[in-house]
């Protein structure tokens, strides 16, 4: 399944002084997501 939360569409949202963290892209940059297979605590959200 394609992941609608893929971080690549976030663009360069971070600028100095900006307080929001890439719209919460932690899941896309998590250890779990990096494994890509097996049991992952952060499965792709449909």
């Amino acid at each position: 399944l394609a992941d609608p939360l893929d971080h690549r569409d976030a663009g360069d949202l971070w600028v100095p002084g900006e307080s929001e963290s890439f719209e919460d892209a932690h899941v896309e940059h998590s250890i779990s997501r990096s494994l890509l297979e097996g049991e992952i605590p952060f499965p792709p959200t449909s």
């Epitope: 939360l5 307080s19 250890i31 952060f42």
Partner: antibody, heavy 114, light 112 residues
Framework: EVQLVETGGSLVQPGGSLKLTCATS????????LHWIRRSPEKQLEWVAQ??????????YYAESVKGRFIVSRDDSKTTIYLQMNNLKEEDTAIYYC?????WGQGVMVTVSS | DVVLTQAPLSVSVTPGESASISCRSS???????????LYWYLQKPGMSPHLLIY???NLASGIPDRFSGSGSETDFTLKISEVEPEDVGVYYC?????????FGAGTKLELK
């Protein structure tokens, strides 16, 4: 098996320095954002620092309480992150965890006391 | 800073009964993409925290479905439908949307 192993904790005097190391294994490291989070003796969790990936120019972010004193860094070739802690204060006493927010290390104790 | 206020600070539950923990945020944690950046962790005695719920209502892998997360933009609830002895520990809510990232003060769950 995913592993995050923190080392380098000890007893240090106020004003002293310490460098924590978090050696990781079991996952592709380079694109992962990693954090240091600490748990105080009062059992409060406090986010300390974050380091993003090479694709994010290794951007770093800090809690106000440690800004200018702590430096987070990473070595992708060693799949390791670090926390250089300078000018330590008694209120820095805590268990320090390395985490990707999903997986956590076992933690390492840092005690700042004279 | 975003303040996360948890209630109660401690709860005593009979095994098999349900328990609910509340977490209130001082600001909305809803992003423009419809993601709610509210996470729940359990720290068992002598252990590291481990993830239960991410993005308000998503169950982390390996976590039994006795656990569920719900809420709005600022008010969140973790529910444990049938408490088991292994559920004892301190529960924390956290937000990873706004720097600095912050945690609630924790709710200690004990067994009656």
């Amino acid at each position: 098996e995913v592993q995050l192993v923190e080392t380098g904790g000890s007893l240090v005097q106020p004003g002293g320095s310490l460098k924590l190391t978090c050696a990781t294994s079991g996952f592709p490291f380079s694109n992962v954002w990693l954090h240091w989070i600490r748990r105080s003796p009062e059992k409060q969790l406090e986010w300390v620092a974050q380091i993003k990936a090479r694709s994010d120019n290794y951007a770093t972010y800090y809690a106000e309480s440690v800004k200018g004193r702590f430096i987070v860094s990473r070595d992708d070739s060693k799949t390791t992150i670090y926390l250089q802690m300078n000018n330590l204060k008694e209120e820095d006493t805590a268990i320090y965890y390395c985490t990707g927010l999903d997986y956590w290390g076992q933690g390492v104790m840092v005690t700042v006391s004279s | 800073d975003v303040v996360l206020t948890q209630a109660p600070l401690s709860v005593s539950v009979t095994p098999g009964e349900s328990a609910s923990i509340s977490c209130r945020s001082s600001r909305s944690l809803l992003t423009s993409k419809g993601i709610t950046s509210l996470y729940w962790y359990l720290q068992k005695p002598g252990m590291s925290p481990h993830l239960l719920i991410y993005r308000m209502s998503n169950l982390a892998s390996g976590i039994p479905d006795r656990f569920s997360g719900s809420g709005s933009e600022t008010d969140f609830t973790l529910k444990i439908s049938e408490v088991e002895p292994e559920d004892v520990g301190v529960y924390y809510c956290a937000q990873f949307l706004v720097y600095p990232y912050t945690f609630g003060a924790g709710t200690k769950l004990e067994l009656k």
